[in-house]
């Protein structure tokens, strides 16, 4: 679709005559008829296949035609077409004399024709005007012409329709050839695809408008290149979404179980050596002069009663010093000048001569110790209880009172929260840092798998030895009716064989 434009510029008819040579009375009141048609080697009469247009009376005899495109569009003349411009044309321009006001062809005498010109040739679509001048014996016509495309039509022959748009079906303007030119931030055949933020991950990110980066499920970060670990993952990472790969020293489903308490918490004080002794438990080996679970207590070197045979201990900056009682000598008063004759053994100890009577040794009764049986046995002096356990003397023996979460003779074992089998209905127990979690079997739910969910309690055939199973609807549990010779909640024990429990 386009327009053939013809601009009439000047018409010269100095003698004011018609084509027949007859003069116009009183002068030649001149108007023009234009016929545009397909290319003909010899322009001949016939249909104006590309269109026709007529002007009003523009002047008398000789006159210049002023540009009147703003005041009604009469000059240049417009010949619109709704087809592909072929690139060639034929043009006929006739100048007519109008004796009256009726300019219709049938109202004019045939001899009212002043002049007729016919041209043909090639014409490309473009903004530039082609200037031409046609002269006959009596007249001269100067004019220019061009072909331009209608609004929204483009290309060499005005055949490409293109309408700029900026909505969700395209964001573009039109190039001179009718191709689309995407607005900044848009791409695709129809400029409908936004260009995401530079670096936005091709697979894991997307965008609905330019310079945006929206993450697909399982991904995060400005460029959607960071995976999201499993919900609740504490000390772990991921390489694909929802993973929880534990950092060194951590374990468990959520990497929240501390396998290296020593490194992560440095609980041992005063240069003590820390040893991991299980999940969230540790043992501190104190340097000389320190004591306590975390070696946090400074120990007087006299506290260990190093002086024997009743020697008194004096603390010094660089250690201690033993003041020996009469009859004893040595660093710890360990050497005696006494013999059995001096009855050196206290608390009912028996004296035995040594080295031909030059020395002796005491054999102490239970609960007493020392070279002379002078010390009551304190079985707690060696801090035997681990993990902060409290040592208690119980006559000839000792016992450890353990902190919550520990057990064993010396509180050396960490008590699993799962040890008391808190998960009902065969639920699997998982130790967590702040408690436990139950994974329930099919048909049960709740924090401890205590809730039956629409599955018959007897469906899993819990009763052994051909016992009859009944569902207790009030408690959502089962009851086994045992055959003769079997007992137990599931009829699992033959009569006469006591059940062996793991505890």
């Amino acid at each position: 679709s386009g327009v053939f434009q013809l601009q009439l510029q000047e018409f010269i008819n100095e003698r004011g005559v018609l084509a027949s040579g007859r003069p116009c009375e009183p002068g030649c009141r001149t108007f023009f008829r234009v016929c545009l048609k397909h290319f003909q080697a010899v322009v001949s009469p016939g249909p104006c296949t590309f269109g026709t247009v007529s002007t009003p009376v523009l002047g008398t005899n000789s006159f210049a035609v002023r540009d009147d495109s703003s005041g009604g569009g009469r000059n240049p003349l417009q010949l619109p077409f709704n087809f592909t411009w072929p690139g060639t044309f034929s043009l006929i321009i006739e100048a007519w004399h109008a004796p009256g006001d009726d300019l219709r062809p049938e109202a004019l005498p045939p001899d009212a024709l002043i002049s007729k010109i016919a041209i043909q040739g090639s014409l490309a679509v473009g903004q530039n005007w082609l200037l031409d001048e046609q002269t006959s014996t009596l007249t001269r016509l100067r004019y220019s012409y061009r072909v331009i495309c209608s609004d929204n039509y483009y290309g060499d022959n005005c055949s490409r329709l293109c309408k700029k748009r900026n909505d969700h079906f395209g964001h573009y303007v039109c190039q001179p050839d009718g191709n689309l030119s995407c607005l900044p931030g848009w791409t695709g055949e129809y400029c409908q695809q936004p260009i995401c933020l530079s670096g936005c991950h091709e697979q894991n990110g997307y965008c609905s408008k330019p310079a945006e980066c929206l993450c697909r499920p399982g991904w995060q970060g400005r460029l959607c290149n960071e995976c999201i670990p499993h919900n609740g993952c504490r000390h772990g990472t991921c390489s694909t979404p929802w993973q929880c790969t534990c950092d060194e020293g951590w374990g468990g489903l959520f990497c929240d179980q501390d396998l290296n308490y020593c490194t992560h918490h440095s609980p041992c004080k005063n240069g003590a050596t820390c040893s991991n002794s299980g999940q969230r438990s540790y043992t501190c080996t104190c340097r000389p002069g320190y004591t306590g679970v975390d070696c946090e207590l400074e120990l007087s070197e006299c506290d260990s009663n190093p002086c024997r045979n009743g020697g008194s201990c004096k603390d010094q900056e660089d250690g201690y010093h033993c003041l020996c009682p009469p009859g004893y000598y040595g660093l710890h008063c360990e050497h005696s000048t006494l013999s059995c004759a001096d009855s050196p053994c206290f608390n009912g100890g028996s004296c035995r001569e040594r080295n031909q009577g030059a020395n002796y040794a005491c054999e102490c009764p239970p609960n007493f110790t020392g070279s002379n049986c002078e010390k009551k046995v304190d079985r707690c002096t060696s801090n035997p209880c681990a993990n902060g356990g409290q040592c208690l003397n119980r006559g000839p023996s000792r016992m450890c009172r353990c902190r919550p979460g520990f057990t064993g003779t010396y509180c050396e074992l960490h008590v699993s929260d799962c040890a008391r089998n808190p998960c009902a209905h065969g639920g699997t127990c998982h130790d967590l840092e702040n408690g436990l979690m139950c994974t329930c079997p099919a048909g049960f739910s709740g924090r401890r798998c205590e809730v039956r969910t629409s599955i018959d309690a007897c469906a899993s055939s819990p009763c052994f030895n051909r016992a009859t199973c009944y569902t207790d609807l009030s408690t959502d549990t089962f009851v086994c009716n045992c055959p003769y010779g079997f007992v137990g909640s599931r009829c699992e024990f033959p009569v006469g064989l006591p059940p062996s429990f793991p505890w």
Partner: antibody, heavy 121, light 104 residues
């Protein structure tokens, strides 16, 4: 050949929410060449565009209905859905889902058969 | 809001040409689609981008659009062409339908 099929309740009470689903078969909803739209037609009246969505979830709504309309897409099921809240008798209409083609300048080249939704107590 | 205006009805004799107009402000700068809807059926796209025919649509359907008016022309109208016809354009991000024209 792609086919569209609307589904949902035919009767909705006033003030409640109208919910419809359009299932696309014979082609993938996950194409950048199409938007998926909802159009309605009250009995004996003309067509009214409600809104549309593409496969990544970008939505566009008719301003006159925007406050009440939600359109969503589920690419895994090859479906898109319409929710219209606080309905009145004026929302009684045949509801169509349609495929709007980017290469066709936004022309809707495929339509569902339509489902009549009546708003009445 | 943007509006498209159509005549309520157009009558035509079989074999003659029917022209349906659709008017809107600066409509010539927008792409116009035309839909045919027969009673009890879903609409069918007959023209897109002003003058393009989808495959399967007869050549007797043609369209044009300039200025403020788009026109759907049915040359050599047949009885089967009796239907409602709707024009449609996009104003910014919103789809707008004309009021519809009944062709008898």
């Amino acid at each position: 050949e792609v086919q569209l099929q609307e589904s949902g309740p035919g009767l909705v009470k006033p003030s409640e929410t109208l919910s419809l689903t359009c299932t696309v078969s014979g082609g993938s909803i996950s194409s950048s060449s199409y938007y998926w739209g909802w159009i309605r037609q009250p009995p004996g009246k003309g067509l009214e565009w409600i809104g549309d969505i593409n496969y990544i979830g970008s939505t566009y709504y008719n301003p006159s209905l925007k406050s009440r309309v939600t359109i969503s897409v589920d690419t895994s099921k090859n479906q898109f859905s319409l929710k219209l809240s606080s309905v009145t008798a004026a929302d009684t209409a045949v509801y169509y889902c349609a495929r709007e083609s980017v290469p066709l300048g936004g022309g809707a080249d495929e339509w569902g058969q339509g489902t009549l939704v009546t708003v009445s107590s | 809001s943007y509006e498209l205006t159509q005549p309520p009805s157009v009558s035509v004799s079989p074999g003659q040409t029917a022209s349906i107009t659709c008017s809107g402000d600066m409509l010539g700068d927008k792409y116009v689609s035309w839909y045919q809807q027969k009673p009890g059926q879903s609409p069918v796209l007959v023209i897109y981008e002003d003058s393009q025919r989808p495959s399967g649509i007869p050549e007797r359907f043609s369209g044009s659009n300039s200025g403020d008016t788009a026109t759907l022309t049915i040359s050599g109208t047949q009885p089967m062409d009796e239907a409602d016809y709707y024009c449609q354009a996009w104003d910014s991000e919103t789809g707008v339908f004309g009021s519809g024209t009944k062709v008898t």
